[in-house]
């Protein structure tokens, strides 16, 4: 009985033509949605003039259908038992699942002003930036539509640079018609305990963004894990969105459409400062903003974003240190809404339901030479938006799963 089931499972979770796993892996059968909540700044003038706390009001959800495109350039390598692929990006706006349209306006931090003043910290260039900012009538904050903010707009300040520079700015620009990867993952043919584990990403086993073990590409992409998952396991996975590998731990048993699944969550320890979690020392890349590596709950991914001062956190600064959220008013973190979880069917290792939550923030600092940043008296890690990417196995697939997998075991 059990041995036969194990043998069948091992055969069906291999990533090769003809298996159940492969069919769902190439093109997910689950509908995946990405909901955005934008932090609309209520007091831009007071912040700019008096360095007041930033008052934000979240507006959303604005929902897009994502991950509907099949993996591309899928190539098996029989020699090292791997399969390589590109994961194409695509997003389709879903008006019926949104509170408004892509043309809705928001007052947000001026991305180009914040980024340029951070990248070019020398005094002379800051004087030039000041001229361009003034000429383009740019300011510390700007009003942008949802479409512009997410997918890109031509920035008036950058457009004045008399050299060929990228003048299009957007939090996810470029997105449509791009792809993530190349990923090369183990197909499990020779060793099922390695199935879906990433061998290389963009041709490398390391990211080159972090020091030491922080730079490693660990585990899978979280869409599935090797079969026969135990509650005691720490599930490692890599997320290109946050430019790092991270991990999830077992939290509870959940019944998902009649299928027993294990809920794994990202623990607060994963976001802790090196003081509390010494393993995180290599995610602390500078001493000033991190207050000598004592701040926690925000991850500086600027090295992964061409020097732009992007900080990733959980929504509403969940699990972040008080100093991070102190300059921001209007945040209400709660675990239920803002943490990330994966519901994994333990026999196959398939993720049947998930909620990936993260927040995109931008650092803005005072600048003596840039007029619109001159009155700031402190650094701000400014929340721009948070997102909730979710997927749940469909009823039909769940029935099939119950009858073919869990039903046979029980």
């Amino acid at each position: 009985g059990d041995l036969l089931i194990q043998k069948t499972i091992k055969k069906q979770v291999v990533l090769e033509e003809g298996t159940i796993a492969f069919k769902n892996w190439v093109k997910t059968g689950t509908e995946v949605y990405r909901q955005f909540w934008i932090f609309d700044v209520q007091n831009p003038q007071e912040v700019m003039m008096n360095s007041s706390n930033i008052q934000v009001k979240q507006r959303g959800p604005y929902t897009y259908r994502v991950r509907f495109l099949a993996k591309e350039n899928v190539t098996q390598d029989a020699e090292d038992n791997t399969v390589s692929f590109l994961q194409p990006n695509g997003a389709i706006f879903e008006p019926s699942l949104s509170v408004g349209t892509e043309a809705d306006n928001f007052t947000v931090l001026n991305l180009a002003v914040a980024a340029a003043s951070h990248i070019y910290q020398n005094q002379f260039v800051q004087m030039i930036l000041n001229s361009l900012i003034n000429k383009s009538k740019s300011s510390m904050f700007q009003v942008r539509t949802l479409r512009e903010l997410l997918w890109g707009y031509r920035d008036p300040f950058l457009s004045l640079v008399p050299y060929p520079v990228t003048t299009t700015v957007g939090l996810f620009y470029p997105y449509n018609n791009t792809a993530d990867g190349v990923y090369k993952v183990f197909n499990g043919k020779d060793n099922i305990s390695k199935v879906a584990i990433i061998d290389t990403y963009k041709g490398k086993r390391n990211l080159s963004y972090w020091e030491s073990h922080c730079d490693m590409i660990n585990g899978t992409d979280a869409a599935s894990f090797p079969p026969f998952v135990e509650k005691s396991q720490v599930l490692q996975f890599f997320s290109s969105d946050i430019c790092r590998s991270i991990y999830a731990v077992f939290e509870s048993d959940v019944n998902l459409k009649g299928i027993p699944v294990y809920r794994f969550v990202l623990p607060s320890k994963a976001f802790a400062s090196p003081v509390e979690n010494p393993d995180n020392y290599c995610f602390c890349t500078e001493k000033i903003i991190s207050k000598n590596c004592t701040s926690y709950g925000v991850l500086d991914i600027s090295k992964c974003k061409e020097g732009r001062p992007v900080y990733i956190s959980l929504p509403h600064f969940l699990y972040a240190s008080p100093d991070v959220s102190e300059p921001i008013d209007g945040l209400n973190p709660n675990e239920e809404e803002h943490r990330t979880y994966l519901d994994i069917e333990p026999i196959t290792g398939f993720t049947l339901q998930f909620a990936k939550r993260l927040q995109v923030n931008l650092l803005v600092k005072p600048s003596e030479k840039i007029q619109v940043l001159k009155n700031l008296k402190r650094n701000y890690i400014v929340p721009i938006l948070w997102l909730n990417e979710t997927g749940t196995i469909g009823d039909e697939k769940a029935n099939m799963f119950r009858s073919q997998v869990t039903g046979k075991i029980n």
Partner: antibody
């Protein structure tokens, strides 16, 4: 083709005034900003003044502050250096130069200013 | 103001020699350093910007290195047309400042 041509140099008495011109072609001076750099006979290069892009602020070396004024006429694509209260130590070849990020990629041929009685 | 100290102030070399000129900034200027070549009676010409970036049209025998406070201009194999005065310049802070120059003469 980018070109910068200075004019207006000459012999002037101490305390006198002179206006140097820098006619630019092949690019728009307002997009880049213009600098004046001088070189005393047999000596090294000294930065004198800068007008930032898009009619931004003007900046001066301490040695000329209050006596020299940099300006630009965008319609003529020409920059100027108005030099008042000239001193013997202002004797030099004056170059105008194009720069955006602070290094000078194009220079004029230079115009000689001699301050002598 | 940031002082740029160049050394040596002059040097004699032969065609084919490898020549190194150094420049020290009085404070950290990151990589915001340019190098120029000037021949008598002529305007300076840009060779290198951002400490290491060769300007277009400049022969590859010229190279720049360094970051922070110490910078080097190297001519890998001196050619007859390279006999000139060389200046470093910091473009990090205003006022922009130059080194005092290094005259490269024929031995």
């Amino acid at each position: 083709e980018v070109q910068l041509v200075e004019s207006g140099g000459g012999l002037v008495q101490p305390g006198g005034s002179l206006r140097l011109s820098c006619a630019a072609s092949g690019f728009t001076i307002s997009s880049f900003g213009i600098h004046w750099v001088r070189q005393a006979p047999g000596k090294g290069l000294e930065w004198v003044a800068w007008i930032a892009p898009y009619g931004g602020d003007e900046y001066y070396a301490d040695s000329v502050k209050g006596r020299f004024t940099i300006s630009a006429d965008t319609s003529k694509n020409t920059a100027y250096l108005q030099m008042n209260s000239l001193r013997a130590e202002d004797t030099a070849v004056y170059y105008c130069a194009r720069s955006f990020f602070g290094y000078f990629d194009y220079w004029g041929q230079g115009t000689l200013v001699t301050v002598s009685s | 103001d940031i002082q740029m100290t160049q050394s040596p102030s002059s040097l004699s070399a032969s065609v084919g020699d490898r020549v190194t000129i150094t420049c020290r900034a009085s404070q950290d200027v990151s990589n915001w350093v340019a190098w120029y070549q000037q021949k008598p009676g002529k305007a300076p010409k840009l060779l290198i910007s951002y400490a290491t970036s060769l300007y277009s049209g400049v022969p590859s025998r010229f190279s720049g290195s360094g970051s922070g406070t110490d910078f080097t201009l190297t001519i890998s194999s001196l050619q007859p047309e390279d006999f000139a005065t060389y200046y470093c310049q910091q473009h990090s802070n205003a006022p922009l400042t130059f080194g005092q120059g290094t005259k490269v003469e024929i031995k």
